[in-house]
């Protein structure tokens, strides 16, 4: 079925929501004053070999649990990330965006990445897809 303007708009809004969530996480942790940043950077994330289509979000979905574990280190009294809620929200968006009709086997790059590189990769992906929709 060809995408309608309303489905495109919905996809765009969901991608924008995903983008904002990822940027919020990145801004929250990627601060040179963050006491835990260096230790957070010791965690490794798998990066997609290719990420150009919505189905490739499968690769993000598979790394959400490790992401939540690292985010558990990022809380402070004045910075309430609420990792479980945040990851749950991202998971819902990812599932809607990639669809559940086709099962896609994610292919990962050989090199692992830090949380900052990982977030930047998926932020770039979201921005790229949004730009093709507008």
């Amino acid at each position: 079925m060809a995408p309608t303007s309303s489905s495109t708009k919905k996809t765009q809004l969901q991608l924008e929501h995903l983008l904002l969530d990822l940027q919020m996480i990145l801004n929250g942790i990627n601060n040179y004053k963050n006491p835990k940043l260096t230790r957070m950077l010791t965690f490794k994330f798998y990066m997609p070999k290719k990420a150009t289509e919505l189905k490739h979000l499968q690769c993000l979905e598979e790394e959400l649990k490790p992401l939540e574990e690292v985010l558990n280190l990022a809380q402070s009294k004045n910075f309430h990330l609420r990792p479980r809620d945040l990851i749950s929200n991202i998971n819902v968006i990812v599932l809607e965006l990639k669809g559940s009709e086709t099962t896609f086997m994610c292919e990962y790059a050989d090199e692992t990445a830090t949380i900052v590189e990982f977030l930047n990769r998926w932020i770039t992906f979201s921005q790229s897809i949004i730009s093709t929709l507008t």
Epitope: P35, K36, L73, K77
Partner: antibody, heavy 121, light 111 residues
């Protein structure tokens, strides 16, 4: 019981290599970072570096970078601190410690008993 | 690196005494409303033991006579009534910035 058990005391000559160990038990070893701390005779405590046993990712105190190597084998829940060429100034007590960083905190809640390293010709 | 200066470096006290140890940081160890300052106790030939974390939180199993306070650059460890098992060296530690650093230690001896 959560514990970190370190390898025994070592007496070495300058220029020799050495690898000391720290074995975790009573908890999920890959869920916590392991840090190494040096205490020279009659002195205070110095942080050396940290390893994430799950990923193998490390971060070192600039002072110790290139002087020591921190590694881990998650299959046997063990972290290591090694020297390729010991110096007399490496004579010290070395402790491993478990880092806790959830929530608003960052501290060492469990320590190994320490490994005494003596380097003398 | 953040320097931590403990005072006094050593002193003598009697059981039952109220003991206060201070730790002054060369710059603030606070981040977004939290103080990244911890206190450890070390006895001769033993590993350090965590007493207080995040400036004022008592570690599980540590007697309530130990307490911590402070924020920014000035912190205090207080032992409300010194017991015989409390004679040891106490270290403050900041975990706000790498490299983590420890104070020089305060040795509490029997008078």
């Amino acid at each position: 019981e959560v514990q970190l058990v370190q390898s025994g005391a070592e007496v070495k000559k300058p220029g020799e290599s050495l690898k000391i160990s720290c074995k975790g038990s009573g908890y999920a070893f890959t869920n916590y970072l392991i840090e190494w701390v040096r205490q020279m005779p009659g002195k205070g405590l110095e942080w050396m570096g940290v390893i994430n046993p799950g990923s193998g990712g490390t971060y070192y105190n600039e002072k110790f970078k290139g002087q020591v190597t921190i590694s881990a084998d998650k299959s046997i829940s063990t972290a290591y601190l090694q020297w390729s060429s010991l110096k007399a100034s490496d004579t010290a007590m070395y402790y491993c410690a478990r880092w806790r960083g959830e929530g608003y905190y960052a501290y060492y809640d469990v320590w190994g008993q320490g490994t005494t390293v003596t380097v003398s010709s | 690196a953040i320097r931590l200066t403990q005072s006094p470096s050593s002193f003598s006290a009697s059981t039952g005494d109220r003991v206060t140890i201070t730790c002054k940081a060369s710059q603030s160890v606070d981040y977004q409303g939290d103080s990244y300052m911890n206190w450890y106790q070390q006895k001769p030939g033993k590993a350090p033991k965590l007493l207080i974390y995040a400036a004022s939180n008592l570690e599980s199993g540590v007697p309530s006579r130990f307490s911590g306070s402070g924020s920014g650059t000035d912190f205090t460890l207080t032992i409300s009534s010194l017991q015989s098992e409390d004679f040891a060296t106490y270290y403050c530690q900041q975990s706000n910035e790498d490299p983590y650093t420890f104070g020089g230690g305060t040795k509490v001896e029997i008078k």
